[in-house]
Interface confidence: medium
């Protein structure tokens, strides 16, 4: 799937539009929001009923080259004496984000857009029972 | 930037690390990953804190589309079904990266843009500050 | 960062209805629960109540239950305090406060509060 051209549907493209070669587009990889603070709650992947550990995976050819990655600790969630209650689920709770991938081509070096799914985090939920006839 | 390993028969005048810009082919890798939420689990209704999915909608943006978490309660969802104010439901956010157009309107130009997004609930014990 | 500004406090007569303002810069409000808080002369900050991000849920201090309203409205970055049969006991600077999360808020170490808006009951 391409990226939607919104200047055919939405608005007039400007006139002041960078001149861009056939199926590809010009990518500014200074980002806007880089400095901005993130204010989490504290150690919440710790202190939750369904606690999660971080993973770094990193990647040279990725920009950015870093992704955290979260995974459950748990199957079942933790209940109000800190014991694993496996009558409830611990799950992951996943985003999409976009990393600029570098391939090498022999000598040559191409850039493609990548969709990269995160597990941010971990949810506690009550399972599904399918009741087997 | 970053630095990346350098194919050593290659010409020595490639960068190590990323170029401010770059030309990317359009096509996106990946890019059929379900991006409604609401399709892709129920967690949002079955989680012991649950949350309300928010539209967020911006034609300048890539994807145009974001789904916004908002924790539905305070407390947690106890056995009962019951809101459980000893525990708390609090949003789990991420930076991710989008897509901004650059310069506005342009159909093939964009800028890397780092957003904070809610994403979903959890349930944490409170930290309790006992006043002296 | 989220900034909180108050307004609406003033005098008002025993009995009568008040309501507090509290409008908030930054994007991210609704990610916020926000709640009041207030201060009388010589007293310790008392928790009125908080709600969610989402509106959903509001938690009050059991003592103004009745008499008091929380309410937001996340287009406008606006959180308020509808306050009716004022006492003089009433009488305090009320304040607005956020955190991520509800238990911080609820023990008055939230991260981010507002200067205050002084309300007046006479009676």
């Known amino acids: 799937r391409k990226i939607p051209k919104v200047g055919h549907t939405f608005f007039q493209k400007p006139e002041s539009c960078p001149p861009v070669p056939g199926g590809s587009m010009k990518l500014d990889i200074g980002i806007i929001n880089e400095n901005q603070r993130v204010s989490m709650s504290r150690n919440i992947e710790s202190r939750s009923t369904s606690p999660w550990n971080y993973t770094v995976t990193w990647d040279p050819n990725r920009y950015p080259s870093e992704v955290v990655q979260a995974q459950c600790r748990n199957l079942g969630c933790i209940n109000a004496q800190g014991k694993e209650d496996i009558s409830m689920n611990s799950v992951p709770i996943q985003q999409e984000t976009l990393v600029v991938r570098r391939k090498h081509q022999g000598c040559s070096v191409s850039f493609q857009l990548e969709k990269v799914l995160v597990t941010v985090g971990c949810t506690c939920v009550t399972p599904v029972i399918h009741h087997v006839q | 930037g970053i630095t990346i390993p350098r194919n050593p028969g290659c010409p020595n005048s490639e960068d190590k690390n990323f170029p401010r810009t770059v030309m990317v082919n359009l096509n996106i890798h990946n890019r059929n990953t379900n991006t409604n939420p609401k399709r892709s689990s129920d967690y949002y209704n079955r989680s012991t804190s649950p949350w309300n999915l928010h539209r967020n909608e911006d034609p300048e943006r890539y994807p145009s589309v974001i789904w916004e978490a908002k924790c539905r309660h305070l407390g947690c969802i106890n056995a009962d079904g019951n809101v459980d104010y000893h525990m708390n439901s609090v949003p789990i956010q991420q930076e991710i990266l989008v897509l901004r157009r650059e310069p506005p309107h342009c159909p093939n130009s964009f800028r890397l843009e780092k957003i904070l997004v809610s994403v979903g609930c959890t349930c944490v014990t409170p930290i309790v500050h006992h006043v002296a | 960062e989220v900034q909180l500004v108050e307004s609406g406090g003033g005098l008002v007569q025993a009995g009568g209805s008040l309501r507090l303002s509290c409008a908030a810069s930054?994007?991210?409000?609704?990610?916020?629960?926000v709640g009041w808080f207030r201060q009388a002369p010589g007293k310790e900050r008392e928790f009125i109540g908080a709600?969610?991000?989402?509106?959903?849920?509001?938690y009050y201090a059991v003592s103004e239950k009745d008499r008091f309203t929380i309410s937001r409205d996340n287009g406008k970055n606006t959180l308020y305090l509808q306050m009716s049969s004022l006492k003089a006991e009433d009488t305090a600077v009320y304040y607005c406060?956020?955190?991520?999360?509800?238990?911080?808020?609820?023990?008055?170490?939230?991260?981010?509060w507002g200067q205050g808006t002084q309300v007046t009951v006479s009676s």
């Open positions: 406060t956020a955190d991520q999360e509800f238990g911080y808020l609820r023990f008055g170490r939230s991260e981010y």
């Open positions: 709600i969610s991000g989402s509106g959903d849920s509001i």
């Open positions: 930054g994007r991210t409000f609704s990610s916020y629960v």
